[in-house]
Structures are given as C-alpha cells and as structure tokens.
C-alpha cells in the first residue's frame, strides 16, 4: 500500500522517512517499514527500517556503517566476478547494469562448464549457471566460483576442501565450505552472495524446488545404503510405497500477517495436489506456529496420507488461531515436528530407517523467541541417524526446505535451517506472497510432470493452451470443396484422438493439417486410423443417411510431440495414468474407473469450443441416469432421422448424450467442435470420456452460437469406454499402461 501520513500504532513519526524515487509501506502495524522501488531499482542504503522504542526509525546506514540522510532508489547492478580461474571474461567492469552481458572463455586445455554467456537480470542476479573452466584432472570437478563470491582452495583431490566468502554486507547462501567426496561429488550446495534487495523469481524457485523435490535416483535405491559418492541424481524419492513423511510448517505470527498466511495455505494446498499427482501417498504432518506451535495433522493419524482430507484440514486453519500469542518461536515449531518423528519408548518401529522426511517451512525468518531453531535440526539429524556413518550418511532421508517470504527475511537464519545438497537448492527468498503463489502454480507444471496426463496450468497468467494443453485443431483441405474444421485431443506423444467423420477415404495425409499448443505450424501426419466398425453409409438402405456409430479416429504423427506447458496429453479411461490422476489404488480395475467417471446419474462434464479465436470451456451434463432415455429420444429431431422408427438404430450403446435444459441448460457443440474431447474434470485433472460426434440442432448457423435453443438440442459423443479394445490395440506402443 502507498504510504500515508496517518500515524502508525507504533510511536514513530512518518516525517522525513520518504525515499527518493520510490515509496514505502508499513509493516507489523507500523513497527517496521519497507522501501519499495520500481523494477530494476533497489532501496539504498537499506530496504527496511524498524521503529525503535525511543520513537525514532532505525538509522540509514550503508554496508560500511556510514550514515545517510535520505533513502533513495538506486539502479540495480549485478556483482562482478572477483576471480575467474583458468580463463578470461569480457567485458571487465567494476559493475554491470541490468541487461549487460558478459562472456567467459577458457585457456587451452580447459573446458567450459556452465554458461558461456550470462546476462545481468532485473533482480541483480546473473542468468544461467556458474561458468567454470576445468581441465578434468581433479578427483572432483572444479566447483567453480559463483559470481560475487571468493574461493579459497584450488586442489580438488579426494577430501580436499574449498571455502567461500562474500564481500562485506552480503549474505552467503548455500555452503561456505565444500569437501570433495568419494565418487567425485562435492558436499553441500553451491554458494551465492545475496544482497538484501535480492529475491528469487517465481520461475527460479519453482524450477529449483521441484528439481530437488522430484529428482529420481538413477541406480541403487538409497535404502540399499548407498555411500556418499553415489550421488546419482538425488531426489526426494516420491516412493509409491508411501514411506515418506512431509511436514508442512507454517508461520502464523504477527510478522507474517493474515493475507500472507492465507496465501501460504494456498501454496501448500497446491503442493499437496502436486505430490498427489505423482500417484504417491506420503503421510503429512501439519503445524502452524507463533509463540506456540499447534499440530493440526499428525503423521501417525490414519488419514494423514489422504490428500483430500489433509487439504480440508489445511483449509480450515484460521490465522486468528495464534492471535493471542503472536511471537515467532520457530524452535518450538520444529520441536513439534521432532515429536511427530520420534517413536514411543524410544523403540524404533519396523522400517523407520526407510522413511524419508521432508520439512517444508514457510516463514519470514524472524524467530524472536525460544532460541536458535538450528539445534532442533541437529536433534532431528541425530534421531534419523543422518551424517553419523561415513559409509552410509543417509543424507537422502531428510530434506529441509525453507521459504522466506517478504522483506524482513533474515537470510542467515533461513540458510542455516535449510538442507545443503549438491546441485540442489533448499532455501528460497521471495518478494511477497503473490510471488510464492506463482511459485506453486509453476511448480504444478514442472517438466517432470509434463508426461502426466490431464494436467493443466490454471494460473491467472496462463493462455488458452496452458488451460487446454491437449486441444488440437484439425482442418482438411479439399480442392474445390473448401475445408472441414474439427478438433481433437493429444493422447500421447504420437497420437491425436478425433472423430472419424472429419475425414473421407479420399483425404490424403498431406491435405490434413493438425496444430497443437496454439502454434502456427502444422504437424506432419503419418496416417489416419479409423475404427474398423465406422461406416457412415452403413444404414443408407434402411433410410438412415448418415450413421455415426464408432465415429472415432486416431491421427498418427510423423514426429514425436515435445510436451511443454501448452502441449500435453489428456487422460484416457482405463489407463494407469487415469488411476493415478483420480488417486485410486494401483489395483483399480477398468470397471471401477468407469463407475468413478460415468456413474448412473447426471455427470458434470465439459467440452472445449473456439469462439472468436479463443478457446472456452463449456460445462455440460452427461445424461447417464433417469434423463438418459429422453435425451436419446430427442435424436429423432435431427435432420434425416425423423423417419427412424426405433431411435436405438442411430443412438447405439456407443453414445453419450448431453444437451437440453435439465438439470441445467447445456451449451451445445458446433460443427467445428467435432472430434474434440468430452471431458470429466476430477481432482484437478482432466479425463476424456467421449469424442464429440454429432448434434441434433445446428446452433451455430452464420458462425454465431445461438443463445435461445430448443430443449431437444442434444449432442452425441462416442463413449471411449466402448471403444477401448481398439484404443488399446492402436496405442499399445505409447506407454499409457492400459488396464
């Protein structure tokens, strides 16, 4: 909020606190203030000031303790490399402005690792990775000198150590000391030097957090006791057997504030959703804290592995619960976690040493009572027998992630608490809660989950194809006959599922255009595979001009699709992916999926339509209960079907029916929607249950969707459960895991 001269509840006057070129906002009910500068600028000499008991604001002091009269917004610079070993960088300058570039070159005999070119970003950090010139001779690779740090130690033999330092006024994040370990890995994590104005961008946090959260072990599973050198792509193994506990620890103190607390809850709900999407069921512990901790969910509770139930508990937590005791006692909160980890009578249960523990702490990093929480982390490490046995240090069994939110974050405190692991980041500092929410939205979409079906990026910044990443546009160019438009759905890296009636037997592959992800370019087609039972002229003799039974086709692409945020598959029924998406047990049968997705009632579903170049979701109800018969009977109103005596001649068991006005007035499909998916949206995932085939009424004459449509305007869709043998046969090499 922009500053106002209303006197804060504290006793400090706002006179003379203005900042040149920026504004300020009050925090902690006027006990602190934060200077806010435009993008690309930072507050000099400090970002925050506190109201002292004497009634004056803390002094404006520079890093070398000189007093400044007035705060000002200064342009952000990126630090220069203090040292660069075995090579040169250019251009050399005492400081670099935003968007300046530097490039690195190695001397002969040395090879460059990391980024050869780096750009100074708006947050004062360099893009890319640390550039390192290495001759490959050391037992460990050269660990490099992250820009802004200084390194002591230049030998990389087994058990050699290097130490890092920051210039005065900067805080070291990561490991100050790293040791060359067996197998050629370095202990700890790469350091960096942080200025108080530096924040991690949501994208940086999402990438770093998730690459750590989901890194999978290639090689021996950690429970086979792998040694310190066997760092083969560490993970938190999201172990499908469920031997994993995740402790969510949420700061509810005064300094966090109510809106931030609500935002943090949203983030954790997204995290639970994310982890559930992997088809694993960790146990959750849930703690909020201020002066005292409050345990809302214990890992020992029967429902602690039920993601929906845990989410419900989380949503019911109120910021006001800590209002009367609103200090920040992080130590006590972590002791609550310790108490959940430890076992009664000190007798470890069977399998205790195979359970992985993940602590996710969201805080402003300002513990002001109870003592140093790092001592509890040490106790937890002791309890889990971590770091005690050199041959099997068990570091994989504990991960502590700390998310520091806001300007008051104490970087030293949060860095001390977080785990430090090679090539991973466990400590994050974000500007505000909106940024942290961004992180968790982006996280739901990281690359590890790109192959997961039916996942979308529901973020406010998402485009149409972020929200419908499976949607494919199909057009068939027929010389002298114009062109036919249809929709389809990406079901695997090589196949798009659509309607057979979009094509004729004369259509050549080169005349069929398919585009996905909103991209302009068309994809090359190898072949169109029709369902063998589809025959549009199959009942002409019986006076039925067009017969749409088995109206499904698969378009096989020449080249593999590259999944990304705007291109990814929808879930198909009776696949392992759908079992996981619906969070059903791995033993779930096809019939059980059918009961879950298509129960005998009105089923809320959706289809995607293009209106004025925009994709929009249309909510409809599949009539699968008592309204099914009347829905199907309305097919007689379709052009050419008025003479049909028995409607089951045209509406075979292969069809699902939507449309009409009960229970709600359903929107109808248009011609161009044919072939698109009919979708059931469950547990934040999208499962295709049908393919749009035909409609009773053309509600889209003259390119405009009519508002008023008759009650008999129904749409018919091929039920995918009825064409599974064909899907299974044609998609057998696509790794979809049909049940």
């Amino acid at each position: 909020t922009p500053w106002s001269l209303a006197r804060p509840q504290g006793s400090c006057s706002l006179e003379g606190v203005e900042i040149k070129g920026g504004s300020f906002r009050l925090l902690q009910e006027g006990q602190a203030l934060e200077y806010v500068c435009p993008s690309g600028f930072y507050p000099y000499p400090v970002q925050t000031r506190t109201c002292r008991s004497t009634g004056s604001w803390s002094t404006l002091k520079t890093q070398d303790q000189k007093t400044v009269r007035k705060a000002e917004c200064r342009a952000i610079h990126c630090p220069r490399p203090h040292d660069f070993e075995n090579g040169e960088y250019w251009p050399r300058s005492p400081y670099y402005n935003v968007s300046d570039e530097i490039s690195f070159h190695c001397y002969d005999g040395y090879t460059l690792r990391g980024s050869a070119n780096r750009t100074c970003q708006v947050n004062g950090r360099w893009s890319g990775q640390t550039a390192i010139c290495d001759n490959g001779a050391g037992y460990c690779s050269n660990p490099g000198i992250p820009i802004g740090t200084r390194k002591v130690g230049s030998q990389y033999r087994l058990e050699d150590s290097v130490t890092y330092h920051c210039s005065r006024g900067l805080t070291l994040r990561g490991s100050q000391r790293r040791t060359c370990q067996e197998g050629g890995s370095w202990s700890g994590t790469e350091p960096s030097c942080q200025d108080s104005f530096m924040y991690d961008t949501p994208q940086e946090v999402a990438e770093a957090f998730l690459s750590s959260l989901t890194e999978t072990i290639e090689g021996v599973d950690a429970e086979d006791g792998h040694g310190p050198g066997e760092q083969q792509k560490r993970k938190i193994v999201l172990d499908p057997s469920g031997s994993m506990n995740i402790y969510l620890v949420l700061d509810g103190s005064d300094s966090i504030g109510a809106s931030n607390f609500t935002g943090a809850k949203k983030c954790l709900v997204n995290l639970i959703e994310k982890v559930a999407s992997y088809g694993v069921k960790p146990r959750y512990g849930l703690v909020t804290y201020a002066t005292y901790p409050k345990i809302w969910v214990k890992v020992s509770e029967a429902d602690s592995s039920n993601a929906d139930w845990v989410t419900k508990q989380l949503n019911e937590i109120n910021y006001e619960d800590h209002k009367l005791k609103s200090g920040t006692n992080t130590k006590k909160a972590l002791q609550a976690v310790y108490s959940m980890m430890s076992w009664p009578d000190d007798v470890p249960p069977e399998g205790w040493n195979r359970t992985r523990h993940v602590i996710i702490l969201m805080t402003d990093g300002l513990h002001n009572m109870g003592g140093d929480p790092i001592t509890v982390i040490d106790e937890i490490r002791d309890l889990l027998y971590i770091g005690k046995d050199r041959k099997n240090p068990r570091e994989d069994y504990l991960d502590v992630y700390v998310f520091g939110v806001g300007p008051l974050v104490n970087q030293v405190n949060i860095n001390a608490l977080a785990s430090k692991k090679d090539n991973e980041q466990h400590v994050f500092k974000v500007k505000d809660m909106e940024n942290l929410e961004d992180v968790f939205y982006q996280m739901i979409d990281e690359s590890q989950s790109l192959s997961l079906c039916g996942m979308v990026w529901e973020h406010r910044k998402g485009t149409d194809y972020h929200k419908q990443p499976w949607q494919a546009k199909i057009s068939v160019i027929r010389p002298s006959k114009g062109h036919e438009s249809c929709m389809g759905a990406v079901v695997s890296e090589y196949f798009v599922l659509t309607a057979a009636h979009c094509f004729t037997v004369d259509d050549k592959e080169h005349s069929i255009k398919v585009s996905v992800g909103g991209e302009k370019r068309d994809l090359e087609i190898e072949v169109v595979l029709f369902h063998p039972n589809y025959n549009i002229n199959g009942k002409k003799e019986a006076g039925i001009p067009e017969f749409y039974d088995y109206d499904v086709a698969l378009i096989k692409l020449k080249n593999k699709l590259k999944y990304g945020q705007t291109i990814r598959p929808i879930c198909l029924p009776c696949t392992e992916g759908t079992t996981r998406a619906l969070r059903l047990p791995p033993t779930t049968t096809c019939q059980q999926q059918k009961e879950e997705l298509l129960p005998a009632q009105d089923i809320k579903a959706l289809f995607v339509s293009e209106e004025e170049k925009k994709l929009t979701r249309k909510e409809v109800y599949i009539k699968n209960g008592d309204k099914k018969g009347s829905c199907e009977r309305d097919a007689q109103y379709a052009p050419g079907y008025d003479k049909v005596k028995d409607i089951s001649e045209v509406v075979t068991p292969r069809f699902l029916c939507t449309g009409g006005v009960s229970p709600y007035a359903d929107p109808n499909t248009c011609r161009g929607d044919s072939g698109g998916p009919l979708i059931v949206h469950k547990r934040s995932r999208f499962i295709q249950v049908g393919v749009i085939s035909w409609g009773v009424v053309d509600v889209c004459k003259n390119q405009k969707r009519q508002k008023q449509v008759p009650a008999h305007a129904r749409d018919f869709h091929i039920n995918l459960f009825q064409v599974l043998p064909w899907l299974k046969e044609k998609l057998q090499d696509e790794d979809l895991g049909f049940l």
Epitope: N135, G136, A137, G138, Y139, S141, Q155, Y156, R157, L158, E159, E182, G183, G184, S185, E218, G219, V220, G227, G229, E230, Q231, Q232, K233, D422, N423
Partner: antibody, heavy 120, light 113 residues
Framework: QVQLVQSGAEVKKPGASVKVSCKAS????????MTWVRQAPGQGLEWMGW????????KYAQKFQGRVTMTRDTSISTAYMELSRLRSDDTAVYYC?????????????WGQGTLVTVSS | DIVMTQSPDSLAVSLGERATINCKSS????????????LAWYQQKPGQPPKLLIY???TRESGVPDRFSGSGSGTDFTLTISSLQAEDVAVYYC?????????FGQGTKLEIK
Amino acid sequence: QVQLVQSGAEVKKPGASVKVSCKASGYSFTDYYMTWVRQAPGQGLEWMGWINPNSGGTKYAQKFQGRVTMTRDTSISTAYMELSRLRSDDTAVYYCARGYYANSAWFAYWGQGTLVTVSS
Amino acid sequence: DIVMTQSPDSLAVSLGERATINCKSSQSVLNSRNKKNYLAWYQQKPGQPPKLLIYWASTRESGVPDRFSGSGSGTDFTLTISSLQAEDVAVYYCKQVYNLPWTFGQGTKLEIK
C-alpha cells in the same frame, strides 16, 4: 626426476611391528599425497591408505584400521608406514606410490617395493 | 566394498594380434554429473612395481604407446592392446577409485602364444 626410494627387506615375527620408509625426491614432498599399496606373493594389489604430507592427515582402509600408522617427516621428505601385530598373511611387498598434484587417485610414481616377511 | 572382477585370469595371444582384457565392477563407477568413470588400468612386469597405463577409463597416461586403449562405462570396462608386442607380457590390473576403499581386480596374466 621424481624418485621414491624405499627401505630394505624386513623379516619379522608374528605379533611384532614393521616400519617401512619411503624417501621422496625430485618434487615438492608436501604437495602430493603418499599412498601405500601391498602385494602378497603371487597375489593382487591391495590399497592400504594414504597420508597428506602437508597436514599429516591420514585415510586408512577399514581392513587395516587400528594396526596401521602412516606418518611423515617433512624435513627429510620421507613417509613412513608402520604395521603392528603382524600375522603371517601380512607377508607381502609394500609399495609407496604418489599420485598427481590434482588427483591422488592415479598412482603415477611408485617406490621399488619393500618385502616384509612374517615368519615364526 | 566395490568388487572388481577381471576376465580372463590369463590370456595367450600371438605377437601382432589384438589382446582384450575385461573388468567388471560390482557397482557403477560412473559419476553421472561429470560423466567420468573412476577407473584405471595398471601393468606390472615381474619384479617391478605396477605402471599406470590408463585413467578415467580411457585417458592414456603420457608415454604409454597408443596400442593401449581403454573403453567402457558404468560397470563394464575393457583394456585393449591392438597389436601385441613382446614387451607387453605382464599382469594387468584394473582399479576403481569411486568409493573407499579403492580396490583392484585380481589381475589378468598376458602371455605370448
């Protein structure tokens, strides 16, 4: 040029100790780890451990822990390996070896070997 | 401990012919980050200390003739002598330095047929 010269052959009784020396020349002694490897008659090679002559820090193979002591005297550029509580299966040729400056794991230079015979 | 197993135990090859010695480790000695295999080959002639031939599984030590080459990755490695010379008669050892204790193979004795 780099040279590692070891002390002469020894005959010891079971339960006794032996101390083998390795004198280095032709390079800066404290810059390189010194490793000890042994080879029983007609058998393969066995890594025993190393010493960092600069700090005096040692790393021993678990098998020899408690029986082996590696020391150095930087003033005369000499490394020592002492093995106590000798048994007959300790009869072997004991080698000192030096790695590279950057990587102590590749044994580029070796002493000529010292035969230690343990016999009652 | 990582166990190194060489095959064959002994090998007789005619002069000028190719000799191949295999080495298998009980677990991978490849560092997946720096893509290096922590493996070396040594040659030992009777009455002499061993001599370093190959390190990083395929890098030839300076002064070693180019008829010697190393290959393989992960758990399976090969030392090849492309054209056997009389002076190559020796015992050859592979060694892993991925985990402590560093361990050697049992050796392969190479003779002339």
